[in-house]
């Protein structure tokens, strides 16, 4: 299964929008500064495409559902949160149409559940941490610079699965 | 009974390698993530690697990455560390340790082996 | 990594007395520390993890309580059988890290 060239672009406008979508600056939240223990062991110890396009996928449904929460749209500008869905939603059908093809469902396909669990995991802190900082702007901005850091990560493992082949 | 028992410790010359084992029995191994701690004689502990229930993730020590390499057989209950460019600095006893959950963090090691003592030495 | 910081080193009390140690980590770790202990000559053995959760076979004279960055082990009531090290360890994210220990002494 080949992604589109329009994934591609999606991923790279996902990123545009969350740089958009900055409110404050980084730097008048030092304080809130936190490492998340983002699991980057999952997006490099699989060599094949079939064995990320899970984990790929988990990664961006769970973007998705931290971003499409009350205390999210109460945190972000409405339009840009909109247009934030739109691409993700279109991320996740072309990775779940390459699963549809049976990529993904290789001879392996438990050694996976321990990297879908490790991104299940890292979301679980980062939902704790807002829960624990009261959704406060500081804290989204920490989570959204995060998020573009921990997306922009799983994103360049595509590009590079991708100039493999 | 709940057990995990270590082998394969034993005196080793700098720069050389060694390969711990543990078997497990007592609990269905395939479910949990497992780890290795270590502790230097009379020091504290320190943790060394994971590895997750089915074997796909794994996570190390910064002092240990490029070096160590943990690895599991579920089907015999097994869990390894293949440990190279050994150093004075590795003497300790490995603890062989059972996580609470399938993959590491956010979790406990609620179950220790008795340990095995890796001495490096010349 | 995530600094864990554990006092004191060691102390001494008597049979019946209240004993507090204290661990700090250097960022939240939500709830995720966990405390050991470790008697001489033997392997660790978890007593609380997720910060106040006793393990079962865990005497309730011992508890633990904190978030966030601070945590405290008590032992209401110390027992001779106590006598051993004690260990903090944060299981948030890896590497895990462990406090350097406390070594609780009967008087």
């Known amino acids: 299964c080949d992604l589109p060239q329009t994934h591609s672009l999606g991923s790279r406008r996902t990123l545009m929008l969350l740089a958009q979508m900055r409110r404050i600056s980084l730097f008048s939240c030092l304080k809130d500064r936190h490492d998340f223990g983002f699991p980057q062991e999952e997006f490099g110890n699989q060599f094949q495409k079939a064995e990320t396009i899970p984990v790929l996928h988990e990664m961006i449904q769970q973007i998705f559902n931290l971003f499409s929460t009350k205390d999210s749209s109460a945190a972000w500008d409405e339009t840009l949160l909109d247009k934030f869905y739109t691409e993700l939603y279109q991320q996740l059908n072309d990775l779940e149409a390459c699963v549809i093809q049976g990529v993904g469902v290789t001879e392996t396909p438990l050694m996976k559940e321990d990297s879908i669990l490790a991104v299940r995991k890292y979301f679980q802190r980062i939902t704790l941490y807002l829960k624990e900082k009261k959704y406060s702007p500081c804290a989204w901005e920490v989570v959204r610079a995060e998020i573009m850091r921990s997306f922009s990560l799983s994103t360049n493992l595509q590009e590079s699965l991708r100039s493999k082949e | 009974e709940m057990q995990l028992m270590e082998s394969g410790g034993g005196l080793v010359q700098p720069g050389g390698s060694l390969r711990l084992s543990c078997v497990a029995s007592g609990f269905t191994f395939k479910s949990f993530a497992m780890s290795w701690v270590r502790q230097a004689p009379g020091k504290g502990l320190e943790w060394v690697a994971s590895v997750g229930s089915q074997g796909g993730s794994k996570y190390y020590a910064p002092s240990v990455k490029g070096r160590f390499s943990i690895s599991r057989d579920n089907s015999n209950n097994t869990l390894y560390v293949q440990m190279n460019s050994l150093g004075v600095e590795d003497t300790a006893f490995y603890y062989c340790?059972?996580?609470?959950?399938?993959?590491?963090?956010?979790?406990?090691?609620?179950?220790w082996g008795q340990g095995t003592l890796v001495i490096v030495s010349t | 990594d995530i600094r864990v910081t554990q006092s004191p080193s060691s102390l001494s009390a008597s049979v019946g007395d209240r004993v507090s140690i204290s661990c700090q980590t250097s960022q939240s770790v939500n709830i995720y520390l966990n405390w050991y202990q470790q008697r001489p000559g033997k392997g660790p053995q978890l007593l609380i993890s997720?910060?106040?959760t006793l393990q079962s076979g865990v005497p309730s004279r011992f508890s633990g309580s904190g978030s966030g960055t601070d945590f405290i082990l008590t032992i209401i009531s110390l027992q001779p059988e106590d006598s051993a090290s004690y260990y903090c360890q944060q299981g948030y994210i890896t590497p895990y890290t462990f406090g350097q220990g406390t070594k609780v002494e009967i008087k």
């Open positions: 340790v059972k996580e609470t959950d399938a993959v590491a963090t956010m979790d406990a090691l609620d179950m």
């Open positions: 997720a910060a106040s």
